[in-house]
Interface confidence: medium
């Protein structure tokens, strides 16, 4: 393991008494069927809880909502339903919280059968609400301009695009027959519209429009659009190619002023593209395989989003529910976990530590046996349960968890064998970003990270009522239990403030007596368990991505290594809300590993050298870039996006402007070759799928 390990477990003295004095019960006099929670602002302690009870009758839904507000991280709640005039709030739109610490909140009322709708808005963290009538019925949650929370964008159920510049008081209609709309950078709005049809048919005949002045003027930036997506600095559009039903990805890095065709396989009607992750450096793109295979290929882009390297074959991404296990491990740079579908249809977990350059199986946890799925009892891997397992209703209550401020920590359900098993999983933890793993808890659990990793909290997943919470102050090595109530509750969820900086955890559930059930929450503050602030002596230096301490280049990933100050496992102290991860980067010498293969080149398997594609040998590498024909002089390498290496290997690369006008057709389907692209990809979800903080764009 990466940091010091394993003193024998001895419980913290007086923990029960300390926690008992910091456990706050709140019983809601409420029989509603569902509850949604939202934290308003960062570090404010304000939580809004919306309970909803609804019954569908014929074509309409009737119901009631109650709104509760806490100012102390959930220790107590006040019923503030009167602030929303006892109106039924649409739970499917949730509670729309404004960006940053704006304190803004929008609740959308359900006004069944009317031509308009109503919203309740707050600018003071939910202390007070005013209601505004809408001249339309929203199709989805109203969205804030990320840079100006007074400006709101909404799509109506008649596919009209509406905008308000005064936080919902006044609205103006911007456009008709709008199929999809998104905020871009600096108040830019992108949307697809069909000028002579509807959104339900004619996919592929849409115009991509842009407005930079809140709808005073519009510019058509692309035509024959199937769908579009934004990721990092990139604007992607899937465009019909003119070859029947094929479509291809075009990319822009200047908000649609200029476009280039991405070096990716075209896809047919029943396939899809999906941006799995994107930042300002690069993008992970999934291209679905033809046929209903349930898998496709992951490609990683260069810094322009134009040239792509094949990253991973047989990547699991089902058509049916649009499920993929692709997970960004936010606790360590460059690490991603996902699943592949083997030839025998079993699912195996793969991990990359270098942003998709190489993928490997997860190392078998030292304290675990290979299960009976393993052909060889001494050689097997850890396989992680994520979205796909959850969608298949396996006994997996939570997806993998990592937090940027809990450096190196990854928690996930898994099984140890040759492939994912349907058997009841256990919970595993890595403290080094996924290089090594340990079984942390037997059986399925809910888990959360508090105080930037200083405390991990877990609750057993059970169909029976529960009253025990488990916690660990040493990154999951040793666990203590605390009975938070004498009367067990039917558990529905763990809630802690996003960002993993809080020391409060709320346990939500309901109590059931002979005739009634009611919501109840228990909020536990761990501040007295971590009774002192951490000092310098509580931290130790840790080199991330270290696999061979003898090697001078040990820890080098994407051209630099990082040393972190990590909390010692033996230290029981508070990182605190203001904790900032301390890291010291150092630049590495360049090697071929720091370069991807340039246009016209590919890497043979298990080789770090890029070789010329046979069919392009001896040809001038001319291609179209920004509307001019370019001549590329290269020995086959281009630096990986975000790679900071210096010195060492330095392959020559030069692009000459051939001063000829051209159009982006260097990747018309007949010129594509599978050497660098792999095969094109499988069966397609035709609806856009939005998965918050996960999949950036699914066509």
């Amino acid at each position: 393991r990466s940091t010091e390990q394993g003193e024998s477990c001895s419980g913290l003295l007086g923990a029960d008494a300390k926690l008992a004095g910091n456990t706050h019960q709140h019983i809601f006099n409420d029989l509603s069927g569902s509850v949604s929670l939202a934290w308003v602002g960062d570090g404010t302690g304000v939580i809004l809880a919306l309970t909803t009870f609804q019954v569908p009758i014929f074509m309409i839904t009737i119901g009631q909502s109650k709104l509760y507000r806490s100012e102390d991280y959930g220790k107590s709640f006040e019923d503030v339903t009167n602030l929303i005039n006892n109106t039924f709030i649409r739970s499917d739109f949730g509670i729309a919280i404004g960006p940053e610490n704006s304190g803004k909140v929008i609740l959308t009322a359900d006004v069944s059968g009317s031509h308009g709708s109503r919203i309740f808005v707050s600018s003071d963290f939910g202390k007070s609400f005013t209601h505004q009538e809408l001249p339309f019925v929203p199709l989805m949650q109203i969205t804030y301009n990320p840079e100006n929370s007074n400006v709101l964008l909404a799509l109506s159920n008649k596919n009209e695009l509406w905008l308000s510049e005064d936080f919902g008081t006044n609205w103006k209609k911007l456009y008709d027959t709008v199929c999809l709309a998104k905020w871009g950078r600096k108040g830019t709005i992108f949307f697809t519209a069909n000028h002579n049809g509807s959104c339900s048919n004619d996919r592929g005949m849409l115009e991509l429009e842009r407005t930079t002045d809140y709808g005073k003027s519009f510019k058509t930036v692309a035509s024959k659009i199937y769908s579009f997506g934004l990721g990092g600095k990139f604007l992607f559009a899937s465009v019909m190619t003119g070859k029947g039903t094929l479509r291809a990805i075009h990319v822009s890095v200047d908000d649609g002023d200029t476009w280039n065709m991405a070096q990716l396989p075209s896809v047919g009607q029943e396939q899809f593209y999906s941006i799995l992750a994107a930042n300002d450096d690069m993008v992970f793109m999934h291209v679905d395989e033809p046929g209903d295979t349930g898998f496709g290929t992951i490609f990683t882009s260069d810094d322009r989003g134009i040239v792509y390297s094949k990253s991973l074959d047989r990547h699991l991404y089902t058509t049916t529910g649009g499920e993929t296990d692709f997970t960004n491990v936010t606790s360590l740079r460059g690490v991603y976990i996902t699943s592949v579908l083997s030839e025998d249809n079993s699912i195996q977990t793969m991990i990359t530590f270098d942003q998709g350059g190489r993928w490997t199986h997860l190392r078998k946890p030292e304290n675990s046996e290979c299960d009976a799925t393993a052909k060889n009892k001494n050689e097997c891997s850890l396989h992680i349960h994520a979205s796909y397992s959850i969608s298949q209703k396996l006994n997996v209550p939570m997806a993998p968890l990592s937090e940027p401020n809990a450096v190196g920590i990854v928690i996930a359900h898994g099984s140890v064998g040759d492939a994912i098993s349907v058997m009841v999983p256990d919970v595993y933890i890595s403290d080094d970003g996924g290089y090594s793993w340990t079984k942390m808890l037997e059986g399925p659990h809910y888990y959360t990270i508090l105080d930037s990793g200083g405390i991990i909290v877990a609750i057993e997943h059970s169909s029976r009522p529960i009253n025990v919470i488990k916690f660990s102050t040493d990154e999951g090595q040793c666990w203590q239990t605390y009975t938070f109530t004498r009367d067990p509750i039917y558990f529905t969820g763990l809630a802690s403030e996003p960002g993993a900086r809080s020391m409060n955890i709320s346990i939500w559930g309901f109590t059931e007596s002979f005739l009634t059930s009611q919501w109840v929450s228990y909020t536990i503050d761990f501040k007295d368990i971590l009774e002192r602030n951490c000092e310098e002596k509580d931290y130790t230096i840790w080199l991330a991505h270290s696999t061979d301490p003898e090697d001078y280049e040990d820890g080098c990933i994407l051209g630099y290594k990082e040393q972190f100050l990590r909390l010692r496992k033996s230290s029981v102290c508070q990182n605190g809300r203001d904790y900032v991860v301390t890291k010291q980067p150092s630049i590495c010498l360049c090697s071929l590993e720091d370069f991807l293969c340039d246009f016209g080149y590919y890497r043979p398997e298990n080789d770090s050298k890029c070789v010329e594609q046979p069919e392009l040998k001896g040809h001038d590498l001319e291609f179209c870039l920004y509307g001019r024909e370019e001549h590329l002089t290269t020995n086959g390498y281009r630096k990986i996006p975000g790679d900071k290496c210096q010195g060492g290997v330095n392959p020559v690369r030069e692009v000459k402007d051939l001063k000829k006008k051209c159009t982006s057709n260097f990747l018309s389907p007949e010129k594509q070759n599978s050497k660098s692209n792999g095969s094109a990809g499988g069966s397609g979800g035709l609806n856009d799928i939005f998965e918050a903080q996960k999949i950036e764009w699914h066509e």
């Epitope: 046929g291 209903d292 295979t293 349930g294 699991l316 089902t318 579908l341 030839e343 025998d344 249809n345 079993s346 699912i347 299960d371 009976a372 799925t373 052909k375 796909y388 298949q392 396996l394 064998g417 994912i420 098993s421 349907v422 058997m423």
Partner: antibody, heavy 121, light 109 residues
């Protein structure tokens, strides 16, 4: 409705050949591994052969290895078993079964009605 | 090669009684990959249980499966007349890819 329908069985002499077919309907054929299972008169079930969804991987019981060939045509939703060098002990009802779908093994959840192969002189 | 041995070979019970059928593997089998089938005369087998304990679609809840490692059990809590048949256990994933037990005949007493 999910269905498998075998055909091609019959009487054949020892050393002879026969090709069994299995037409699938009601599900996405290419997403599933497929199997042949046989049952000799008055005996239990014996797995014969399996093939992956794409057709890229094939598997055989030792008793038929080198004599039987499993294949599939996903465009026609059809599974095949080419049997050669047939022996008296290959006499059985041959069932086509649906095997593993994406991800988890859910048993052989769909069976055909069976086709009878008799090897006799 | 994994050998599955079912016991008893024949089980004679009356409707309404409880039936317990056993399947023992010669070496450890993943519970994920153990299934039970029912076969009536002149019919194709029908999947009852997969993953050692999960009931297949449409199977009544009087059928249940349990066990792990080398010992697995199929239980029919209250026998109905239509339950009298031959029952096979099956493992998946080792070499050979599938192995069936020799079967247990459940007959009316």
């Amino acid at each position: 409705e999910v269905q498998l329908l075998e055909s091609g069985g019959g009487l054949v002499q020892p050393g002879g050949s026969l090709r069994l077919s299995c037409a699938a309907s009601g599900f996405t054929f290419s997403s599933y591994a497929m199997n042949w299972v046989r049952q000799a008169p008055g005996k239990g079930l014996e797995w014969v052969s399996a093939i992956s969804g794409s057709g890229g991987s094939t598997y055989y019981a030792d008793s038929v290895k080198g004599r039987f060939t499993i294949s599939r045509d996903n465009s026609k939703n059809t599974l095949y078993l080419q049997m050669s060098s047939l022996r008296a002990e290959d006499t059985a009802v041959y069932y086509c079964t649906r095997g593993r779908g994406i991800g988890y093994y859910n048993g052989m959840d769909v069976w055909g009605q069976g086709t009878t192969v008799t090897v006799s002189s | 090669e994994i050998v599955l041995t079912q016991s008893p070979g024949t089980l004679s019970l009356s409707p309404g009684e409880r039936a317990t059928l056993s399947c023992r593997a010669s070496q450890s089998v993943s519970s994920s990959y153990l299934a039970w089938y029912q076969q009536k005369p002149g019919q194709a087998p029908r999947l009852l249980i997969y993953g050692a304990s999960s009931r297949a679609t449409g199977i009544p809840d009087r059928f249940s499966g349990s066990g792990s490692g080398t010992d697995f059990t199929l239980t029919i809590s209250r026998l109905e007349p239509e339950d009298f048949a031959v029952y096979y256990c099956q493992q998946y994933g080792s070499s050979p890819m599938y192995t069936f037990g020799q079967g247990t005949k459940l007959e009316i007493k």
